[in-house]
């Protein structure tokens, strides 16, 4: 009778095992093992027992011990079961971002692993089991469908294999796939709201605001604001499920014309976009041209107003004739015109909006000097010892210099409070002088002596 020990072995792939072949007869003619595996005989004294080291066991095998005794030949098999954990446990790739409400199919593929009867595939969300199935086929494939919810955001999905060899006195061998982290999102069907100026003047700054509600997770939303090819750099403010992106936009002469303002919101693998046109225009203030900004009284003055070729101007409230970008008026300069403002208002239509620009210039009229009775009386009579203020105002532009002298030397203190004395009496020659010329006027001061009773 041939016997084998152990009769059943479970061993790791590539492992070795010692198999003892024994026979019940004392002097067997033959005792050995039949196996395709590499083997070594581990010698022992005696004839009725042989120990073999079988090595590099890659797959299940049934080595057979045999013996030839006087009473006949017999055999005994040992069953070698190889175990090994799967070489590949993988979740089929999925886009990391998934919209809420979508059905997501998780597919786990398992390559290798044995014995298959002890191999189970488990699909998990975090530590929660979603599906558990025995590994069948090569590669084994297990799938499950998940309805994507908001609270799945950031959840880790994985696939685990369990090679349970505890019934065989070994352990539970687990292999886990790389996790798939689900990013859920909600991007509303409504496009973002874009608030911006419809028209923007060259070399100025405008403010653009792009906003959208009903986003999840709002902090992951990417906002792209651009005017033509110019990428804007917005400051984004987040609410619970909304954002507002505010950016300053500066335009130059190169941007003139109709430009496309874009606000794109990207969340997950989806985007929403709003387009708006902005007209960039150049409209310098109109030019007010005076023949000369400073003229002498009586000079003919031409006032011209020139604006953007497509503008319409009014000069001092009078529209150009014909209506257009130029207007002018002629006048003879009078002292009353000194300091007079000439205002030109230009109006330009840009993308249906009327834009107004103004420019003002002031005319200076040189005149005088003047000394007249109203402002410089020719006769003063004052009681002696009274307090008086001699007044004489010379007019002209530029303002004349005024001096009043008696006998060419004694000055009359104009604009100063004085005590009237006999010395003050007399005739004074008041002289007003400016770059425009000189005028004189005689002023007589009479002093009344007190009457003694």
């Amino acid at each position: 009778q041939t016997s084998v020990s152990p009769s059943k072995v479970i061993l790791p792939r590539g492992g070795s095992v010692l198999v003892t072949c024994s026979t019940s007869c004392d002097q067997p003619k033959l005792l050995g093992i039949e196996t395709p595996l590499p083997k070594k005989e581990l010698l022992l004294p005696g004839n009725n027992r042989k120990v073999y080291e079988l090595s590099n066991v890659q797959e299940d095998s049934q080595p057979m011990c045999y013996s030839n005794c006087p009473d006949g030949q017999s055999t005994a098999k040992t069953f070698l079961t190889v175990y090994w954990t799967p070489e590949r446990v993988e979740l089929a790739p999925l886009p990391s971002w998934q919209p809420v409400g979508k059905n997501l199919t998780l597919r786990c593929q398992v390559e290798g692993g044995a014995p298959r009867a002890n191999l189970t595939v488990v699909l998990l969300r975090g530590e929660k089991e979603l599906k558990r199935e025995p590994a069948v086929g090569e590669p084994a494939e297990v799938t499950t469908t998940v309805l994507v919810r908001r609270d799945h955001h950031g959840a880790n999905f994985s696939c685990r294999t369990e090679l349970d060899l505890r019934p065989q006195g070994l352990e539970l061998f687990e292999n886990t796939s790389a996790p798939y982290q689900l990013q859920t999102f909600v991007l509303p069907a409504t496009p973002p709201q874009l608030v911006s100026p419809r028209v923007l003047e060259v070399d100025t700054q405008g403010t653009v605001v792009c906003s959208l509600d009903g986003l999840f997770p709002v902090s992951e939303a990417q906002v792209h604001l651009a005017l033509g090819d110019q990428r804007l750099n917005p400051t984004v403010t987040y609410g619970n499920d909304s954002f507002s992106a505010k950016a300053s936009v500066s335009v130059t002469a190169e941007d003139e014309g109709t430009q496309r303002l874009t606000c794109a919101v990207i969340l997950g693998n989806q985007s929403q976009e709003t387009l708006q046109t902005v007209t960039i225009y150049s409209f310098p203030a109109p030019n007010v041209i005076l023949t000369k900004p400073e003229v002498s009284e009586g000079t003919e003055v031409t006032v011209k107003c020139e604006a953007h070729p497509r503008a319409k101007v009014t000069l001092n409230g009078v529209p150009a004739q014909p209506l257009g970008p130029r207007a002018q008026l002629l006048l003879k300069a009078t002292p009353e015109d000194n300091g007079r403002s000439f205002s030109c208002s230009a109006t330009l239509e840009v993308a249906g909006q009327l834009i107004h620009k103004n420019q003002t210039r002031e005319l200076r009229v040189l005149y005088g000097p003047r000394l007249d009775e109203r402002d410089c009386p020719g006769n003063w009579t004052w009681p002696e010892n009274s307090q008086q203020t001699p007044m004489c105002q010379a007019w002209g532009n530029p303002l004349p210099e005024l001096k009043c002298l008696k006998d060419g030397t004694f000055p009359l203190p104009i604009g100063e409070s004085v005590t009237v004395t006999r010395d003050l009496e007399g005739t004074y020659l008041c002289r007003a002088r400016s770059t425009q010329g000189e005028v004189t006027r005689k002023v007589t001061v009479n002093v009344l002596s007190p009457r003694y009773e």
């Epitope: 010692l18 070594k40 005989e41 581990l42 010698l43 022992l44 004294p45 080291e53």
Partner: antibody, heavy 116, light 107 residues
Amino acid sequence: EVQLVESGGGLVQPGGSLRLSCAASGFNIKDTYIHWVRQAPGKGLEWVARIDPANDNTIYADSVKGRFTISSDDSKNTAYLQMNSLRAEDTAVYYCTTSGYWFAYWGQGTLVTVSS
Amino acid sequence: DIQMTQSPSSLSASVGDRVTITCRASQSISNNLHWYQQKPGKAPKLLIYHASQSISGVPSRFSGSGSGTDFTLTISSLQPEDFATYYCQQSNSWPYTFGQGTKVEIK
């Protein structure tokens, strides 16, 4: 009948070399493993080296690694232990033995004395 | 390396006595332990392999037991030819190592 016979021992100066032989009979060395085990005078047993004659796979004790080389010749059914850079502490009876994990058959031993 | 410690180092016993020798491994070696008997001037002789497996031609009074780290060789009734030195050896991992030996002497 399984038999192992060692030869090649003797007196050698420190730093010298010796080559021990182990002639096997009654079995084919390719079908098992051959080991060398030594025993210093009055001391215990120390495993030295092992060879798998089927593929010349070898393993050594740290104390002899780099100095001793175990080899085999299938045609002669003989294993060898080449000992170089010998030291006084290598003085021992060297046994050739067979089997894989245990040592079922031993030779009679050959004495190696390292002394100046 | 796995250290093997035998106890006692020596013992005196009389013919017919039951003798027990223990061997302790510095770490678990499963059942990869073997026992040898050596008489002066002779090569060692295998008595037990794999902790408890008997050898053809070895008297049945020799038996072995144990697993993991603690092992025992028992001679149920000591005979005159059993006075010798006994060694344990582990084959769990390289390098294979022996115990320091236990000398059994006549009392």
